[in-house]
């Protein structure tokens, strides 16, 4: 098909982060077209010669795909017609980080938008009471992080207190030699208090809370990706 008249269509991307070894999504939406056969989606990566992915005439066109993305990409084919050009990236690698461009061609015109994609490892921490210790101790563990994060303890009762003197954090390299297991131990814990173990790197921030009373232990954890509107 051809484009008659110069029109620019709106393309929107969202910065996101990928967890290495897992699948990731590079988000991109555009003004939809009536005919699927008139839509071309091209994903490019800065510094890469071949295409990350191309979808045209209703199907994948991978003849120009770069070797580093071979067999790892897919668009949501059934959602292209409604303006979803998001890319699914399988088995995210550390080297997938960088600037991507979502380039769209339709019968209405062309448009593109860039996207910053960060890669690393992040996981939920779990906080437990360490009954093996000689004093009341909490142990915070998270299985996969990269780059190396910072770990900070906080408490509801002693707000603003610095626990660095009564805590010890270690990082153990996992078998794939990239990600690390995070273990942090907090000593001299008091009953009837809520403690938070906060793990953070430039990609994600995760918090594990534990409420310790004489009668029960309550746990809660959550993870938030940084610099991402997702």
């Amino acid at each position: 098909f051809g484009i008659s008249g110069r029109h620019s269509i709106t393309v929107t991307t969202v910065a996101s982060a990928g967890n290495i070894g897992e699948d990731g999504i590079l988000s991109c939406t555009f003004e939809p077209d009536i005919k699927l056969s008139d839509i071309v989606i091209q994903w490019l990566k800065e510094g890469v010669l071949g295409l990350v992915h191309e979808f045209k005439e209703g199907k994948d066109e991978l003849s120009e795909q770069d070797e580093m993305f071979r067999g790892r990409t897919a668009v949501f084919a059934d959602q292209v017609i409604v303006g979803n050009a998001s890319l699914r990236l399988k088995n995210v690698q550390l080297t997938d980080a960088g600037t991507y461009k979502c380039y769209i061609i339709t019968s209405k015109g062309k448009g593109n938008a860039n996207l910053e994609y960060k890669t690393g490892a992040f996981s939920m921490p779990e906080v437990n009471v360490d009954y093996n210790a000689s004093s009341e101790t909490l142990r915070c563990e998270a299985p996969r992080w990269f780059p190396q994060p910072t770990v900070v303890w906080a408490s509801q009762v002693d707000q603003g207190a610095n626990f660095s003197e009564v805590s010890n954090t270690s990082f153990e390299l996992n078998s794939e030699n990239v990600t690390m297991k995070v273990v942090s131990v907090l000593y001299n814990v008091t009953i009837n208090n809520t403690y938070s173990c906060m793990i953070e790197n430039d990609i994600a921030k995760a918090t594990g809370d534990i409420k310790v009373t004489e009668s029960e232990i309550k746990r809660r954890s959550h993870l938030q990706l940084l610099n991402s509107k997702a």
Partner: antibody, heavy 117, light 105 residues
Framework: EVQLVESGGGVVQPGRSLRLSCAAS????????MNWVRQAPGKGLEWVSA????????YYADSVKGRFTISRDNSKNTLYLQMNSLRAEDTAVYYC??????????WGQGTTVTVSS | SYELTQPPSVSVAPGKTARITCGGN??????VHWYQQKPGQAPVLVVY???DRPSGIPERFSGSNSGNTATLTISRVEAGDEADYYC????????FGTGTKLTVL
Amino acid sequence: EVQLVESGGGVVQPGRSLRLSCAASGFTFSNKAMNWVRQAPGKGLEWVSAISGSGATTYYADSVKGRFTISRDNSKNTLYLQMNSLRAEDTAVYYCARKRWYGMDVWGQGTTVTVSS
Amino acid sequence: SYELTQPPSVSVAPGKTARITCGGNNIGVKAVHWYQQKPGQAPVLVVYDDSDRPSGIPERFSGSNSGNTATLTISRVEAGDEADYYCQVWDRGMIFGTGTKLTVL
């Protein structure tokens, strides 16, 4: 300041070899794909070769395929063009240029290669 | 292989508008870039992605692209605009147009 500086040009006999270098500064070299482009005297621009940021992927124009090799040393921020079996028609000013998506946004000042007996 | 055709020369009076065309099969679906090259100097990118201008390039330079023709438009032409102009697309390599010599009368 973003800068590309080519070197290594000169006069060489047909069939001989020459290696061009391009020193990059002012940007993260390893993140950018790079190109060599040439211009014969009084002629237009002709793309020669391209290399990905990692150096893993290379493309060549048909006119130089099998004779020229593009490479890079990211630790030295330097791009190279090894030119073997040179011909008279390879006489040109050779530019290195930074690839930016589908175009080239930064060019060096060029180095002159003359192939003559 | 893909080919881009430009007129060899375009002449224009100072203060007027110059239009340089670049023809290619269904070029409207490709991203077109334009370079200015003055004698003895390296090319300079003046328009990228059909119609966007790099920082430092005057607003007088604009581009459009549809169908089989991309166009570089230089409004209020100045003597300093006299140069060779090349269009370029990517097609498994950089493809350059044949080049157009802009003469300011």
